[in-house]
């Protein structure tokens, strides 16, 4: 049985041109994580974090992506595009995967409020 | 290369204790969870448990808590088995073995030490 | 936890043979499965992982099949340095072994 849980950022929104940090928290386990994937709504891959090799940033977002805080993501030079659903993957020894999910909404306002709470999906 | 390289063998007595080590070289030591696994004389492989070599936390399988007592030393790459107070039944060769492969399909025990033989006899 | 249970425990066969070895786990277990050969007072030796991936360095004739709760190594063309015991395994949640098979010279 699973016993530990994935902690994310939730629904948060912010400005276009902007940036947010897309975080997710593995706890409650003794598991070792051995490999972070974030995907974004469409399935493709935007980086890895290998426990050996370090962070891998996929082509298509090496210029909008950078690695971290911790095992999180920074997304950068935000588009109307990039709202929708990102997943973090965590996989761990002994456990199995864990899968965490953040909606991202990106407004076009001013006024556009980034929230950073964390929640429970 | 990739190598694990275990103490040599130990006969002990009955009561006593014993350290196993296990040397870890050619990769990074904290990137792979180590387990440990027992081989009676004539038998079969036996879980022991793992070592989160990241935080050091040890998980034990059924049938081998209390006495057996999983550790490391990050600086010199290094996993030790510690087994007190020895019985005759403590016997077998004792391995220690890395979980290769970074997503969760890829596991398995890919690199293994080659094994130190414990001997518990009056 | 997942308890493995490999049959034959021993096989008997001939160098050219063809062998098969089957391993079932008492709950599925997607593909999370390896198979390791082990010869006597050497430690034992990755042959396959994720139940049909081998392991580089380990000779074709090994292969590996199965998903969920039925599993089989087989030995397309048994070589001499083939005769050993062969245990199947499981790294998920709990890990545990199967009991081995013994693959002798007939």
């Known amino acids: 049985m699973m016993t530990g849980t994935i902690e994310t950022t939730g629904n948060i929104s912010a400005k276009k041109g902007g940036s947010v940090i897309l975080q997710c928290h593995l706890s409650s386990t003794m598991a070792q994580v051995t490999q972070v994937n974030w995907e974004q709504h469409d399935h493709s891959l935007l980086a890895i974090r290998n426990a050996e090799l370090g962070w891998h940033i996929y082509p298509a977002f090496k210029d909008r992506v950078a690695p971290g805080p911790g095992l999180g993501l920074t997304l950068q030079s935000l588009t109307m595009n990039d709202t929708g659903e990102y997943f973090c993957t965590y996989h761990t020894y002994p456990d199995g995967t864990y899968r965490g999910r953040i909606f991202l909404e990106v407004l076009e306002s001013s006024v556009a409020e980034h929230s950073a709470r964390f929640q429970i999906p | 290369q990739v190598q694990l390289v275990q103490s040599g063998s130990e006969l002990k007595k009955p009561g006593a204790s014993v350290k196993v080590s296990c040397k870890a070289s050619g990769y990074t030591f904290t990137s792979y969870p180590m387990n440990w696994v027992r081989q009676a004389p004539g038998q079969g492989l036996e879980w022991m448990g793992w070592?989160?070599?990241?935080?050091?936390?040890?998980t034990y399988a059924q049938g081998f808590t209390g006495r057996f007592v999983f550790s490391l030393d990050t600086s010199v790459s290094t996993a030790y088995l510690q087994i007190s107070s020895l019985k005759a039944e403590d016997t077998a060769v004792y391995y220690c073995?890395?979980?290769?492969?970074?997503?969760?399909?890829?596991?398995?025990?890919?690199?293994w030490g080659q094994g130190t033989t414990v001997t518990v006899s009056s | 936890d997942i308890r493995l249970t490999q049959s034959p425990s021993f096989l008997s066969a001939s160098v050219g043979d063809r062998v098969t070895i089957t391993c079932r786990a008492s709950q599925g277990i997607s593909s999370y499965l390896a198979w390791y050969q082990q010869k006597p007072g050497k430690a034992p030796k990755l042959l396959i992982y994720?139940?049909?991936t081998l392991q580089s360095g380990v000779p074709s004739r090994f292969s590996g099949s199965g998903s969920g709760t039925e599993f089989t190594l087989t030995i397309s063309s048994l070589q001499p340095e083939d005769f050993a015991t062969y245990y199947c395994g499981q790294v998920m949640r709990y890990p545990a072994f199967g009991g081995g098979t013994k693959v002798e010279i007939k």
């Open positions: 994720a139940a049909s």
């Open positions: 070592i989160n070599t990241n935080t050091g936390n040890p």
């Open positions: 073995a890395r979980v290769g492969g970074f997503t969760v399909p890829e596991y398995a025990f890919d690199i």
